[in-house]
């Protein structure tokens, strides 16, 4: 089954610094999202090989890419306190496939010592309702019907 390997699990950086998030898959993608999770999840970027990437206006001019959609490194620059959050890669294939998430902690420089990442990956409760790293049928189909549909190949 398709998987998304995402790293790092967590990173603590001072205001104004940069962070790299890497999303790796076994290939066969149509594209990949980086999304910031929360009550109103937000698309940060959509990357597709051979196409100019699309970036949310909040991050426009602050994001660089290297690699390909199968092994993509996203660099977010000039981080602000409001950028703190959990970011997850979503691979677009025939099913939904998620990375495990990256918790980015942006801190004032003087408070660096108070906010540190542990080595554990982000808690599952901080990620979307679907189990992380798993392949799921199209959730819109599932949510629109009284009974979840059987898993099927989607376009």
């Amino acid at each position: 089954a398709q998987e998304v390997q995402q790293s790092p699990h967590c990173t603590t950086v001072p205001v104004g610094a940069s962070v790299n998030i890497t999303c790796s898959t076994s290939g066969g993608l149509r594209g990949i999202y980086l999304r910031q999770l929360g009550p109103q999840p937000q698309d940060i970027i959509y990357y597709e090989d051979g196409v100019v990437p699309t970036t949310d206006r909040r991050f426009r001019g602050r994001i660089d890419f290297s690699g390909s959609q199968d092994n993509l490194t996203i660099t977010m620059h000039r981080l602000q306190l409001s950028d703190t959050g959990t970011y997850t890669c979503q691979a677009i294939t025939e099913v939904n496939v998620y990375g495990s998430g990256t918790l980015v902690l942006v801190t004032e420089e003087q408070s660096q010592g108070w906010h540190r990442c542990s080595d554990a990956p982000p808690r599952a409760s901080a990620l979307p309702a679907p189990p992380t790293g798993s392949a799921l049928p199209d959730p819109q189909t599932a949510s629109a019907l009284p009974d979840p549909p059987a898993a099927s190949a989607l376009p």
């Epitope: 594209g31 999304r35 597709e48 196409v51 979307p128 679907p130 819109q140 629109a144």
Partner: nanobody, 116 residues
Amino acid sequence: QVQLQESGGGLVQPGGSLRLSCAASGFTFSMAVMGWYRQAPGKQRELVATITPGGNTYYVDSVKGRFTISRDNAKKTVVLQMNNLEPEDAAVYYCNRAYDTHYDYWGQGTQVTVSS
């Protein structure tokens, strides 16, 4: 406020054509993988065609070679051109974001009837 407005359905004979259109607003359309779904009476809603922000298209086997999906990011519209329609294509057609987990808004759909 998210809005999806489908139009263009109707009654057509087998072998005929229809052009469905969807106007979207309330989200960043240019970043969205968009899809056309359909639901026939008593059946599950199925995703029949998708188009990525970059314009790459994908189709379920049953419509390949007959349906064409396209998009206009400036106008925030997505179109499904349906040719050589078959009775099995009859359904209510909806457009929406595809492969999304945090999004559950639907338009009213547009009815496609294929009958002689």
